[in-house]
Amino acid sequence: KSSNEATNITPKHNMKAFLDELKAENIKKFLYNFTQIPHLAGTEQNFQLAKQIQSQWKEFGLDSVELAHYDVLLSYPNKTHPNYISIINEDGNEIFNTSLFEPPPPGYENVSDIVPPFSAFSPQGMPEGDLVYVNYARTEDFFKLERDMKINCSGKIVIARYGKVFRGNKVKNAQLAGAKGVILYSDPADYFAPGVKSYPDGWNLPGGGVQRGNILNLNGAGDPLTPGYPANEYAYRRGIAEAVGLPSIPVHPIGYYDAQKLLEKMGGSAPPDSSWRGSLKVPYNVGPGFTGNFSTQKVKMHIHSTNEVTRIYNVIGTLRGAVEPDRYVILGGHRDSWVFGGIDPQSGAAVVHEIVRSFGTLKKEGWRPRRTILFASWDAEEFGLLGSTEWAEENSRLLQERGVAYINADSSIEGNYTLRVDCTPLMYSLVHNLTKELKSPDEGFEGKSLYESWTKKSPSPEFSGMPRISKLGSGNDFEVFFQRLGIASGRARYTKNWETNKFSGYPLYHSVYETYELVEKFYDPMFKYHLTVAQVRGGMVFELANSIVLPFDCRDYAVVLRKYADKIYSISMKHPQEMKTYSVSFDSLFSAVKNFTEIASKFSERLQDFDKSNPIVLRMMNDQLMFLERAFIDPLGLPDRPFYRHVIYAPSSHNKYAGESFPGIYDALFDIESKVDPSKAWGEVKRQIYVAAFTVQAAAETLSEVA
């Protein structure tokens, strides 16, 4: 059954009217408008864009559109004292310097205020020393270096290739290894797809291209100076020494031309295996230090960036609900970019703009959604999800009582192969039903549904005939809504073929070459993938805001809880002796999952049968659905991560981008064999099983009959 039939929701003509109003040509026009100059967070240009969006959303017909400002910690390079890295000889003379900025793309030579590549929030410093190549700087890479190869990174400058994990995790790992500086670079193995030309002739990264990005380890805190609370006019700010998540060692990013010059001289140990080799014509020696003739040469970093409290602006638009105005469905995506933001974020912002326009058109014709829809253009996402987090902190009491769902809308595309969806299990059925009603934009799937092309190209690893839907991790603005507040969340975009393109993200990510032309020439000339993403995101918002019964299926949560329990049990069972010694049992967790499954099944039966014309019962059932995600929140949060409060999902402690299931248990078990006090370590595993079992049981009980 479609969700419409299953829950007697939106009359189809309304949804159809909304979807039919979405136009690819408008998305194209909006993207062009949003990408002609840089819109870096905290700059005048981004403030002006905020005011433009506010004005246009009002014109489109929203009931109100307000700017919400906060004063948060941002980071910028010093305009007169540029950041760079040198090779110095024994006399201290700089014999090689890395590039100060990327050569501008054609047509953008005269654009001012292009921020040069930098690692946001790097401290200042001029460390010099021997280089150690640490592959991707993942946890396992440092294990390989320190435990297997006996290489000590203490007092060294490490060079790591971008990719696989969030850059902030790389820096954290390097700090823990004792490094005194980090150089991040884009290796062609990860950012240059074979058979594709480099920009401006294709979508590959040129040798002078560099990925910008923040290197924080905020763990959901938002503004580093005001964790837990909004950075408003009367905020109490921590001193910089107490700020959350700031790196303690200088960090700087470079392109592969510059990396070649640093890596070609490397001596010391050979790479441990082929997985440590990229595509440059260098040996990928680990070091430490340079080889023979060059052994007296050192690497020196020159980092002069500054951290500054700066005003940022969210745009918040409201379309009031006709029946349940106190129930909020939120569509949000960021507006700030590193440079032009051709993909990140403006391909998403342009889609949001068109969705707002379509909703506004329906509203002008007399229609209103059942529930209130909030639209958000977030600021300072690139600096640590700051705009969304501060707004959610300011409005947390309203959100935790009224928040139905959050749909994220960053980059609409990271490729043009198939759909990619990450969401709460509550939304699986919504996504399935919606994509069955939408046309596929893919070549070879003319006249077929999006569900069909998506399932064919990205099949679920568990369920045949169904598409892959991934866990939510972090690294985007849904984080505070899902991981902290427990509001059901989802995201959708078009992606690449992960089988054939093993590079990380898309090659021009966060570089100056992420332009309108990149999208218009190489990714989506007809803007048909953008339109499809608009239909998916907009369609989800429409259903969530307009269905009589919320389109959430709690049975899908039961299925994944069982899968996650099996997985974490398997991990633990790699230590059968210790489990026996310390009496570690997962019985309570499996029992809670079993109870959840039974209660969810009964709830779903009641959901089919109850009297939908009774507004009190309808509201009661909807509240049980709305508050189910909330029930997975532990008010105490995860160990050492108080703002990651969801017991079922959290960003991986080793990669912020990835989601981990039963993260409390997972982290307690991680590398447990190396713990100095095994009794204490297994005691923590038992405590985390207890917390997880209790939370699942408590969540199950929210679905029981109320009396």
Epitope: I95, F96, N97, T98, S99, L100, F101, P103, P104, P106, E109, K197, S198, Y199, P200, D201, P206, G207, G208, Y257
Partner: antibody, heavy 120, light 107 residues
């Protein structure tokens, strides 16, 4: 061995037209951006026009925009420049040169040049 | 357009001397600066790329330095074959431009 050989230079009247050619050999011509660089009688070097490897993107310096057209025939391994509405300041030795970095140009390989003289 | 100003216009030296040629950009060009040598009736020849990176086949007495707007080509102990014109070129932003040249002549 990489070789670039220009031809087509001549004495031409003010306002006249001329087509220069550059025959390339010793490398995969279709894999490289190419440029025309001219050297004035005063020995100044000036980049005139560039073309991408497929021939679908062209770039011109302001002084020749609308008058000169750079093109290429990858099947024939040949670079061209059609020059029209020639001015006396177009008098120069015209070199074809191969880019070593895609769009962003520095030049290892140059031809020997072909002389264009525009007379009143 | 980015203007590259080379100085001096002419430099008269004795073989064995060490010399420095200057190239100044009208705006920052990072390290996207290259040096060429041109002898009479010959095409330009690349000496140094990206400020300081040596080119195979070019003698090690040629070296480059600088960053941003100010760059230097140094010739350590000039030899007779080094006399001719020297040009700098930027590849930072279109149109790629050359300096006016420095003529290195025998004193």
């Amino acid at each position: 061995d990489v070789k670039l050989v220009e031809s087509g230079g001549d004495l031409v009247n003010l306002g006249g037209s001329l087509k220069l050619s550059c025959a390339a050999s010793g490398f995969t011509f279709s894999g490289y951006y190419m440029s025309w660089v001219r050297q004035t009688p005063e020995k100044r070097l000036e980049l005139v026009a560039a073309i991408n490897s497929d021939g679908d993107n062209t770039y011109y310096t302001d002084t020749v925009k609308g008058r000169f057209t750079i093109s290429r025939d990858n099947a024939k391994n040949t670079l061209y420049m059609q020059m029209s509405s020639l001015k006396s300041e177009d008098t120069a030795l015209y070199y074809c040169a191969r880019h070593e970095d895609g769009y962003w140009a520095w030049f290892v390989y140059w031809g020997q040049g072909t002389l264009v003289t525009v007379s009143a | 357009d980015i203007v590259l100003t080379q100085s001096p216009a002419t430099l008269s030296v004795t073989p064995g001397d060490s010399v420095s040629l200057s190239c100044r950009a009208s705006q920052s060009i990072s390290n996207h600066l290259h040096w060429y040598q041109q002898k009479s009736h010959e095409s330009p020849r690349l000496l140094i790329k990206f400020v300081s990176q040596s080119i195979s086949g070019i003698p090690s007495r040629f070296s480059g330095s600088g960053s941003g707007t100010d760059f230097t080509l140094s010739i350590n102990s000039v030899e007779t074959e080094d006399f001719g014109m020297y040009f700098c070129q930027q590849s930072n932003s279109w149109p790629w431009t050359f300096g006016g040249g420095t003529k290195l002549e025998i004193k």
